[in-house]
């Protein structure tokens, strides 16, 4: 997260760290007791590595009573996700067992009504991604509030040049932005999950390259079918 601040500890009990061989790889969001939603591209280079999900964490390194690392029983990328596009960049991870819920571990309601969030709406994005252009990784969860950007502006040639479909949304990126390592994490508007940070090699913090988020409402049928 660029231009953000440290989050209040455990105030986002839905927040997950998707880990590869014990190290933070991507963000994720607990959407059901046994399911974490993240980004498909996160596992592209995972190959034979061990994928796990950390819940109930604020610090990645310090012991915390609510922290627990779960093995992944099943990883379900969206069937239409592809390495070279940002489209359908969703991944559902089934935990090896139902998460132990409590004040620091709780699923987040997700948007089912397929309607765009109004431009200008302030939404919260959180993650353990890099906090500066030098690539410094934080130990504790960071967050930032970002205004939603209208799709027409996001589709301008100097922004994302027509790449933003109806299944994607954008948020402003003027020094405050999601960045590498935040992919798969939640964009929360009004207490509801609206978007998932897409994973790509997008430049962060440049106002002409807005953050791109997958609209979960557009994938309600797929999410429901996997969780069923």
């Amino acid at each position: 997260i660029l231009g953000g601040r440290e989050a209040e500890a455990h105030a986002r009990p839905y927040m997950a760290s998707v880990q590869l061989n014990g190290a933070h790889l991507c963000g994720g969001v607990l959407v059901a007791e046994q399911w974490v939603l993240s980004a498909a591209h996160c596992l592209e280079d995972a190959a034979d590595g061990k994928v796990q999900v950390l819940l109930g964490a604020h610090s990645l390194s310090q012991p915390e009573p609510s922290k627990r690392l779960y093995d992944v029983l099943r990883a379900v990328p969206h069937p239409d996700s592809q390495p070279d596009t940002i489209d359908h960049d969703l991944l559902l991870l089934q935990l090896s067992e139902k998460a132990t819920l409590g004040p620091a571990v709780r699923p987040l309601p997700w948007q089912r009504v397929d309607r765009d969030v109004a431009p200008g709406t302030l939404c919260d994005v959180a993650g353990w991604g890099i906090v500066n252009h030098a690539g410094r990784r934080p130990d504790s969860l960071q967050h930032v509030l970002l205004p939603v950007l209208d799709r027409a502006t996001c589709n301008r040639r100097t922004h994302h040049d027509g790449a933003i479909t109806e299944r994607l949304m954008c948020a402003e990126s003027n020094r405050r932005d999601s960045c590498k390592g935040d992919s798969g994490g939640p964009l929360v508007c009004g207490g509801v999950l609206e978007g998932v940070v897409t994973s790509g090699s997008r430049v962060c913090g440049n106002r002409k390259k807005p953050g791109i988020y997958t609209r979960v409402a557009s994938y309600a049928a797929w999410i429901d079918s996997v969780l069923a």
């Epitope: 799709r151 027409a152 589709n155 301008r156 100097t158 027509g162 440049n206």
Partner: antibody, heavy 116, light 112 residues
Framework: EVQLVESGGGLVQPGGSLRLSCAAS????????MNWVRQAPGKGLEWIGD????????DYNADFKRRFTFSLDTSKSTAYLQMNSLRAEDTAVYYC?????????WGQGTLVTVSS | DIQLTQSPSSLSASVGDRVTITCRSS???????????LEWYQQKPGKAPNLLIY???NRWSGVPSRFSGSGSGTDFTLTISSLQPEDFATYYC?????????FGQGTKVEIK
């Protein structure tokens, strides 16, 4: 299939006004800026300006700012170009073109002739 | 405003010829996001322009591989490696990095 269809061109006297329409189909109208470009007979392409179909924000080439105005009817997925105080040198084919990707989609153009 | 100057203004060539059109801008067209929004359009008489190349060197969908773009800073080139009968048209360069966006004056490619 993305389609842009202009209409409203024709013969108009100097000093007169004309409103051109650009009807869009095959995509969500509010997801892309609309631009207007003109081409005088035998001449090159000239950018007039653009409009954001969500906010209505406009940007005009300084040469057109005083006399030309963009507007929208999102319920009809249509953009409009209102041209006032027309002169002989405004005689041209007028195109609308969607921005994103680049100017990949254009209307067929509508000819405006300013003559007495 | 940024001026784009194309050369030549017109040229005569035969089918199979290699054709090069240059476009020079009056100032750099590198955008503040680091990208260069230099595009090439082809226009045939009585028709709307067609996008050929975007961001200097990227071919638009369906554009034949004989069309290529190159350049940086202020100097750009469109090359047609082997001219085909359907390529006789007018070509325009365009910069979208700075408002007002501008077109070159055009290069007409005629049959020899």
């Amino acid at each position: 299939e993305v389609q842009l269809v202009e209409s409203g061109g024709g013969l108009v006297q100097p000093g007169g006004s004309l409103r051109l329409s650009c009807a869009a189909s095959g995509y969500t109208f509010t997801d892309y800026y609309m631009n207007w470009v003109r081409q005088a007979p035998g001449k090159g392409l000239e950018w007039i300006g653009d409009i954001n179909p969500v906010t209505g924000d406009t940007d005009y080439n300084a040469d057109f700012k005083r006399r030309f105005t963009f507007s929208l009817d999102t319920s009809k997925s249509t953009a409009y170009l209102q041209m006032n105080s027309l002169r002989a040198e405004d005689t041209a084919v007028y195109y609308c073109t969607r921005e994103g990707p680049s100017f990949a989609y254009w209307g067929q153009g509508t000819l405006v002739t300013v003559s007495s | 405003d940024i001026q784009l100057t194309q050369s030549p203004s017109s040229l005569s060539a035969s089918v199979g010829d290699r054709v090069t059109i240059t476009c020079r801008s009056s100032q750099t067209i590198v955008h503040d996001n680091g990208d260069t929004y230099l595009e090439w359009y082809q226009q045939k008489p009585g028709k709307a322009p067609n996008l050929l190349i975007y961001k200097v060197s990227n071919r638009w969908s369906g554009v034949p591989s004989r069309f290529s773009g190159s350049g940086s800073g202020t100097d750009f080139t469109l090359t047609i490696s082997s001219l085909q009968p359907e390529d006789f048209a007018t070509y325009y360069c365009f910069q979208g990095s700075h408002v007002p966006v501008t077109f070159g004056q055009g290069t007409k490619v005629e049959i020899k």
